[in-house]
Each structure stands twice: as C-alpha cells, then as structure tokens.
C-alpha cells in the first residue's frame, strides 16, 4: 500500500492502485480505490499522467470536470460515478492507444484528507490463441493462431508426454503485420505430432502470456486456452 501524504493541515487517506495493462484499440481500466466519504460532493478525484501537461480526468462535486483535461485523453475517459461514494476511483479508458503507456497518479481529496498512489500502465496487444489440427499438411501438423499481439511475442511449444522437450527444430513461427500497422497476427506450426498427446502453444510478451492447449486422441479433439496479464501488482 502507498499512503497519501498529509498535506496542508489535512490528514492522509489510503489510496490503492493496481498496475495493469491495456489492449490497444479496446477499452481499459486503471484501478484505484480509496477510503470512502459519506458525502459525494466532498470527493475530488484527479487522474494525472507523468509527462502530460493537462489532467487525464477530474471528477468533483459529483460530476466530471474536464476543463483542464489534456487533449490526448479528450472523449476517452470516465469514472464509475455511481461507485465513487463507496471508494472506487477507477478510470475507464476508451480505445487504448500505444501512447497511453506510462505512470499514472490517482489523486484523491475527501473531507477526511488527501492521498495519492501511482500506477504503471502498460499497453500492447494480446489475444487468445487457437490450436487446430492442420489437415492440409502432409504429416500430422498443429497450427496455433492468435490474431493480435504487440510487441512481438515469443512462441514456445510444449507437450504433456515429452515434458521438457525442445520443439524449436520441428516448429515454424511467423508474424504478419495487421492492417493498422502496429499489431501482428501470430501463426506457429508444429510438425510431426503424435496422437494421444496434449500440446501447448505458449505465446508471451512483456504484457501478457497466453496458452492454447489441444488434446488429440483417435476419437476426439479437445481444446482449451487461457490468457494471463503479467505484472499486475497492487501499490
């Protein structure tokens, strides 16, 4: 926890943030909570970004106050107004841009005092991989595809039966730039797969880690995938 300073004769209040990551082109959340106040009109929320001249967002006297908002955030921010009274100062950021990455400060003033906490926000692209059997190939082949990643990730194959095996010699990974010229489509092909085995395609960059699993037996194919954001820590 980072405790806000007691300033100007006021007491300090506890403000808590959680480092997070935004998926470019989608909406993101910058999380911040604080000791609630009984009166909404006494609560001021200010979001700042290091290196940016104006405010990211300001909420005071029960409504948004955007006269000092920086132009790079215009029309893209909102707080959860109905949850401010219970201590939620989280910010919704629409259409996340690569340039939104950086250090943010959640700055709170209530009748109890002031407090602030910083938050590291990373931006990139990440998506769930899907693993399929490539029936067009001459041998038993698996194809792992994920539509949007940035920065360029690493791709590693693993198998339940051959744990610890290195599949780099029998796999081929390509990255295809998407139409917006930032994100890339990830395609990885694994050759010479054996039946009755579970294979995992693991895609990872410094923002997210995603895994696509496929289990191939004589009678069925089972798929499972999951995605985990990295470095989400509270402060």
């Amino acid at each position: 926890l980072i405790i806000g300073f007691g300033i100007s004769g006021r007491h300090s209040i506890t403000v808590t943030t959680v480092a997070s990551a935004g998926n470019i082109g989608e909406d993101g959340i910058l999380s911040c909570t604080f000791e609630p106040d009984i009166k909404l009109s006494d609560i001021v929320i200010q979001w700042l970004k290091e290196g940016v001249l104006g405010l990211v967002h300001e909420f005071k006297e029960g409504k948004d106050e955007l006269s000092e908002q920086d132009e790079m955030f215009r029309g893209r921010t909102a707080v959860f107004a109905d949850q401010v009274i219970v201590g939620n100062a989280s910010l919704r950021l629409k259409n996340v841009q690569l340039t939104d990455a950086g250090t943010y400060k959640c700055y709170i003033i209530t009748s109890k005092g002031k407090g602030n906490a910083n938050l590291e926000y990373k931006t990139g692209a990440f998506s769930m991989p899907e693993v399929n059997v490539d029936y067009n190939a001459s041998s038993e082949t698996l194809r792992c595809e994920a539509p949007r990643w940035f920065p360029q990730p690493t791709v590693v194959w693993a198998s339940q039966v051959d744990q610890g095996a290195n599949f780099s010699e029998v796999s081929n990974t390509s990255f295809e730039l998407n139409s917006e010229n930032v994100t890339m489509k990830v395609v990885s092909v694994l050759y010479n797969v054996t039946i009755n085995n579970t294979y995992s395609c693991m895609i990872e960059n410094d923002i997210a880690k995603a895994t696509g699993d496929i289990k191939v037996t004589e009678s069925e194919i089972k798929r499972r995938s999951h995605l985990q954001l990295l470095n989400s820590k509270a402060s």
Partner: antibody, heavy 118, light 106 residues
C-alpha cells in the same frame, strides 16, 4: 538515469539565427512534454516554449512568438529551438527541461549560453 | 497572462530556522503551482508540484501549501545546503515564474 544535454549556443549578431538542441536519454522521450526556459545574466527564470510528447501541440511566450520555433525528433530523442530575428534581450542561458507531474518540470539540462551582440 | 508575485525578495536566516516564502497569483490557478530551488551557476531543481506534492528525493523539511491565489513554501529547519534562490511557477495557463526569493545566511 535521466540526462538532458543542450548545445548550439554561442555569439550571434542582432537579427541573426541560432538553433539549439537538447539530447535526451534515460526515459521514453516521446511520452514526455518538453520545454525551453531561459535566464538572462543575473535575472530570474523565464519560460520560453513547450511542446507535448508527440510534438503536435506547442506553446510560446509572447516575447518569442513568431520568432522562435520549438520542435522535436522523437526518433532521435532530441528537442530543438530554432531562434530567428534574435535581439539583445534574448541573451540568456537556455535550459531544456522534461515534464514530470502536473505540468511541472522535474529534470533540467545544464544550460547553453546564447549571446546576442554586435 | 497570469502574474506571480513572490515575497520576500530576499530572506536572511540561520541554520535551523523555519522559513516561509509566499507566492501570490494574479488570478486563481487552483493548485497548479510548482516550487524550484536554484543555486548559482546551476539548473533549477524541482521541489514541489501541484502546490503541495513533494517531488521524489526531496527532503521532507520542504513543504508546500495553498490553493487558488495564495501559496507558501516552508522549510521547517533550514540546512546549510538550503541557501539558494527559490522560484514559484504556475502551470495553469501556460507557465510563469515568480521573480525569485534569495535565501541568504544571516
């Protein structure tokens, strides 16, 4: 470690031009607004110009508007100040500085001296 | 343009003293005010931003307060390293500096 290194200062005649550069390192340059501030010998600080991180927005003090141009090359991590139609009253140490929180400026270069004299 | 008036222009004090410098804005600037310290031949150093937030690495004997048009910088116990010139700067509408306060040894 954040470092800002100004260069390009020197002696110039009234009406002449100079281009100051500020080489930045130790931070993601394109994410931070930058500014130029000057200080005439024995005098206080005077804000000159500011640019947003992208370079898309620029601001100028009335005393230099129309004569000075701030710009940045984010691929080279460098800030510039093109100074035209220089006057004796432009004589000063010119500092570049990096924006921190709430439009304050947390890191400054060591300064470069510009002398306008005939 | 927003004008900043700083006073006193010179302040004589001794090590251990508590000193206060005032900065007055010609119109309300909310809490968009910063304080800097400058020593001869050196670049300014940021002490306080947003009127009362202490810059990282700055000793806690420095504090800022105020809002609107009236602001103060306080040094709770003056140290030998604190003898310098102090400037306030408004960041609300463009940027303007106060004329400076020189803190000298009594």
């Amino acid at each position: 470690e954040v470092q800002l290194l100004e260069s390009g200062g020197g002696l110039v005649q009234p009406g002449g031009s100079l281009r100051l550069s500020c080489a930045a390192s130790g931070f993601t340059f394109s994410s931070y607004a930058m500014k130029w501030v000057r200080q005439a010998p024995g005098k206080g600080l005077e804000w000159v110009s500011t640019t947003s991180g992208s370079g898309g927005t620029t601001y100028y003090a009335d005393s230099v508007k129309g004569r000075f141009t701030i710009s940045r090359d984010n691929s080279k991590n460098t800030l510039y100040l093109q100074m035209n139609s220089l006057r004796a009253e432009d004589t000063a140490v010119y500092y570049c500085a990096k924006a921190g929180w709430a439009a304050a400026f947390d890191y400054w270069g060591q300064g470069t001296l510009v002398t306008v004299s005939s | 343009d927003i004008q900043l008036t700083q006073f006193p222009s010179t302040l004589s004090a001794s090590v251990g003293d508590r000193i206060t410098i005032t900065c007055r804005a010609s119109q309300s600037i909310s809490d968009w005010l910063a304080w800097y310290q400058q020593k001869p031949g050196k670049a300014p150093k940021l002490l306080i931003y947003k009127a009362s937030s202490l810059e990282s690495g700055v000793p806690s004997r420095f504090s800022g307060s105020g809002s609107g048009t009236e602001f103060t910088l306080t040094i709770s116990s003056l140290q030998p390293d604190d003898f310098a010139t102090y400037y306030c700067q408004q960041c609300n509408s463009y940027w303007t500096f106060g004329q400076g306060t020189k803190v000298e040894i009594k």
